[in-house]
């Protein structure tokens, strides 16, 4: 199989990863997209995903992971705020391309989360940021129930990942907590 | 067609200040991030702010931090940067762009020239 | 701040030749990195995004690749009207950092 490459990301509790998945937008513009965790041995599980069709730059919230899709760029953000060190994990952005295997975007994201005081409050960018509120009204899209036939026992190729239940989205925060993220200067 | 369409460059002695302009039609203004990149003359690009649809994020380079405001206006479709504290480093060919973080879309430009 | 780091600064290339241009990054940017062509007296136009996707309506002479820190734009057969200035620009991170250009020349 392809090796796919991991793009490492070291943040600490209390920032936020941001991470930008570009796609080919004429092909996969208004195609559902998904944020998958990837537990060793496991299937990918899907955290969230957007609406289907995905709506253009309408944010989704699950818990205090927020996706933009936004068509006219080909590109898909993908933000988990106020990380803890539980959240550390492999990560990746696919496109959901019934009936064939979801396509896998970008590079997976190795996140790495530790205990300390960060020096940029609130998110993984630096101090540039003046403004930063999550938005008020988000949904919660529902996704799709994928299983794939093909068991795990090594990496997918680089333009395929699986996806089972999106059972694991309740382990990071339930969908009513209140998010706090600091506006700073 | 996208067009992005700058005004407000113009002659202004250091320690003044402008305000740049951008009229965007052909696309969905509300729905786009968007952002100024100045290239001083003979020099190359460098982005200076950017801006989210609704203005929950801003972002700017240190440069610029304090002395510029970007900001926007969904309802007639346009983006400003208020350029205060100008600098003769300031010069350059202003450019409003579609995007925030890479940019599709470049209008033709407005100069500001700082010079006493 | 992410230094992008262009070479060469010129490169001499005849018609019809393959010309191939360098970005370098001072840490990774992942694939979040895109090519611009800038001509003579008119603003940008960008080319690649996401390091080997073509922006529309680019022609497929222009291809991206690399990712991590290396990157490589490539202009298979060059065409008269391709003789510009182009820019790398990595996205992953603010502040949002170009790199000093490549100028095409003809040979």
């Known amino acids: 199989a392809t090796k796919l490459t991991e793009e490492k990301y070291e943040l600490k509790e209390g920032q936020t990863l941001d991470v930008k998945c570009d796609y080919t937008l004429e092909k996969f513009a208004s195609s559902q997209k998904a944020w998958q965790i990837i537990r060793d041995g496991e299937m990918p599980k899907t955290l969230a995903c957007t609406e289907r069709p995905s709506k253009n730059s309408h944010p989704v919230q699950v818990g205090r992971i927020i996706l933009e899709d936004y068509h006219d760029h080909g590109l898909l953000r993908v933000r988990m705020v106020n990380l803890q060190v539980e959240d550390s994990g492999l990560y990746q952005c696919v496109i959901y391309q019934p009936p064939k295997e979801p396509h896998m975007l970008f590079d997976r994201i190795r996140l790495v989360v530790t205990k300390g005081f960060s020096g940029t409050p609130g998110s993984n960018e630096n101090s540039t940021q003046n403004v930063y509120k999550i938005p008020p009204t988000t949904t919660k899209a529902l996704c799709p129930l994928y299983t794939s036939p093909r068991t795990v026992t090594q990496a997918p190729p680089k333009s395929t990942a699986d996806v089972s239940t999106p059972d694991s989205e309740i382990n990071l925060t339930n969908v009513t907590d209140i998010i706090r993220v600091p506006v700073f200067n | 067609e996208v067009q992005l369409v700058e005004s407000g460059g113009g002659l202004v002695q250091p320690g003044g200040s402008l305000r740049l302009s951008c009229a965007a039609s052909?696309?969905?203004?509300?729905?786009?991030?968007m952002s100024w990149v100045r290239q001083a003359p003979g020099k190359g690009l460098d982005w200076v702010a950017s801006?989210?649809?609704?203005?929950?994020?801003?972002y700017y380079v240190d440069a610029v931090k304090g002395r510029f405001t970007i900001s926007r206006d969904n309802a007639k479709n346009s983006l400003h940067l208020q350029m205060n504290s100008l600098r003769a480093e300031d010069t350059a060919v202003y450019y409003c762009?579609?995007?925030?973080?890479?940019?599709?879309?470049w209008g033709q430009g407005t100069l500001v020239t700082v010079s006493s | 701040e992410i230094v992008m780091t262009q070479s060469p600064a010129t490169l001499s290339v005849s018609p019809g030749e393959r010309a191939t241009l360098s970005c370098r990054a001072s840490?990774?940017?992942?694939?979040?990195l895109a090519w611009y062509q800038q001509k003579s007296g008119q603003a940008p136009r960008l080319l690649i995004y996401?390091?080997?996707i073509r922006a529309t309506g680019i022609p497929a002479r222009f291809s991206g690749s690399g990712s991590g820190t290396e990157f490589t734009l490539t202009i298979s057969s060059l065409q008269s009207e391709d003789f510009a200035v182009y820019y790398c620009q990595q996205y992953k991170n603010f502040p949002l950092t170009f790199g000093g250009g490549t100028k095409v020349e003809i040979k």
């Open positions: 052909g696309f969905t203004f509300s729905s786009n991030w």
């Open positions: 996401g390091a080997s």
């Open positions: 762009v579609r995007g925030g973080w890479r940019f599709e879309s």
């Open positions: 840490q990774s940017v992942s694939s979040n």
């Open positions: 801006i989210k649809q609704d203005a929950s994020e801003i």
